[in-house]
């Protein structure tokens, strides 16, 4: 099996304020085992947007059923977008570890820009 790649096919996505934004991400392999997380920004100050394993993310829904066997699609939809949501979003694969999961590979990022609500 080829080594896993994290594919974010869109470099940028533009959404009108108030709408939902779909951020696409998929894996080329099911291995290694471990959760997916979405972050806004990179580095130490990045903001967690979604954690497949745990947590409550009321504005975020997954596009596919993540529990489905052989699922490779980890795209998310963020509802009620505001200008504060603008930024670059990264889909990150973690490898299952003990006691903590270890970051394995990140997607290239998708820049979300927010347009003014059409009048």
């Amino acid at each position: 099996e080829d080594e896993l790649q994290v594919i974010q096919p869109e470099k940028s996505v533009s959404v009108a304020a108030g709408e939902s934004a779909t951020l696409r991400c998929a894996m080329t392999s099911l291995i290694p085992v471990g959760p997916i997380m979405w972050f806004r920004g990179a580095g130490a100050g990045r903001e967690l947007i979604y954690n497949q394993k745990e947590g409550h993310f009321p504005r975020v829904t997954t596009v596919s059923e993540l529990t489905k066997r052989n699922n490779l699609d980890f795209s998310i939809s963020i509802s009620n977008i505001t200008p504060a949501d603008a930024g670059t979003y990264y889909c990150v694969k973690f490898r299952k570890g003990s006691p903590d999961d270890v970051e394995f590979k990140s997607g290239a990022g998708t820049e979300l820009s927010v347009r003014a609500k059409p009048s």
Partner: antibody, heavy 122, light 108 residues
Framework: QVQLVESGGGVVQPGGSLRLSCAAS????????MNWVRQAPGKGLEWVSA????????YYADSVKGRFTISRDNSKNTLYLQMNSLRAEDTAVYYC???????????????WGQGTTVTVSS | EIVMTQSPGTLSLSPGERATLSCRAS???????LAWYQQKPGQAPRLLIY???SRATGIPDRFSGSGSGTDFTLTISRLEPEDFAVYYC?????????FGGGTKVEIK
């Protein structure tokens, strides 16, 4: 530019065999899943077969399972479809098509060849 | 096996009009795996929409896709002369990667 060129079509008798080829250029062939799709005269599109980028997994429509074999040679940037036990209902234009992303079968097929015609007739 | 059903079979419209094409899956599917293609006579298909709602590169914004679950729609807001063609939806992700039967958009 990104291009797919099919060849190998022709007229064959029922029960006969043909091997189609698809030569790829302009992209990293070894990174993408590939597909064969056919279209019978005056009919719609029918997905036939797909293969992962590494060639490690293959997928077939029920209508061709056991008769057709998809394969690829990444060193030659070429996709193949070996067609055996051909039937009249296999008569169609055969297109090869590239997966849109490196993830097999995700989002769609973004590059298509112009097709090669296979006619099965006695 | 999931069946993709397109309707109507033929849509007769004039340039400038709005076209609404439907694609229905026999069971719920992820929108990530729904694509739309355009095919003109004698030509190969062209990817229009992927992930149910995202336009492929170079596709004009008069084309839009929507839907989720079992019901998906391709809308052409104002038909241009070059838009008269056959349109197919396709379910990806699983095998077989089923196409719908197509909708022909013809000039009225």
């Amino acid at each position: 530019q990104v291009q797919l060129v099919e060849s190998g079509g022709g007229v064959v008798q029922p029960g006969g065999s043909l091997r189609l080829s698809c030569a790829a250029s302009g992209f990293t062939f070894s990174a993408y899943g590939m597909n064969w799709v056919r279209q019978a005269p005056g009919k719609g599109l029918e997905w036939v077969s797909a293969i992962r980028a590494s060639g490690g997994a293959t997928y077939y429509a029920d209508s061709v399972k056991g008769r057709f074999t998809i394969s690829r040679d990444n060193s030659k940037n070429t996709l193949y479809l070996q067609m055996n036990s051909l039937r009249a209902e296999d008569t169609a234009v055969y297109y090869c098509a590239k997966d849109f992303t490196e993830v097999v079968g995700w989002l769609g097929m973004d590059v298509w060849g112009q097709g090669t015609t296979v006619t099965v007739s006695s | 096996e999931i069946v993709m059903t397109q309707s109507p079979g033929t849509l007769s419209l004039s340039p400038g009009e709005r076209a609404t094409l439907s694609c229905r899956a026999s069971q719920s599917v992820s929108s990530s795996y729904l694509a739309w293609y355009q095919q003109k006579p004698g030509q190969a298909p062209r990817l229009l929409i992927y992930g149910a709602s995202s336009r492929a590169t170079g596709i004009p914004d008069r084309f839009s896709g929507s839907g989720s679950g079992t019901d998906f729609t391709l809308t052409i807001s104002r038909l241009e002369p070059e838009d008269f063609a056959v349109y197919y939806c396709q379910l990806l992700g699983s095998s077989p990667r089923t196409f719908g039967g197509g909708t022909k958009v013809e000039i009225k």
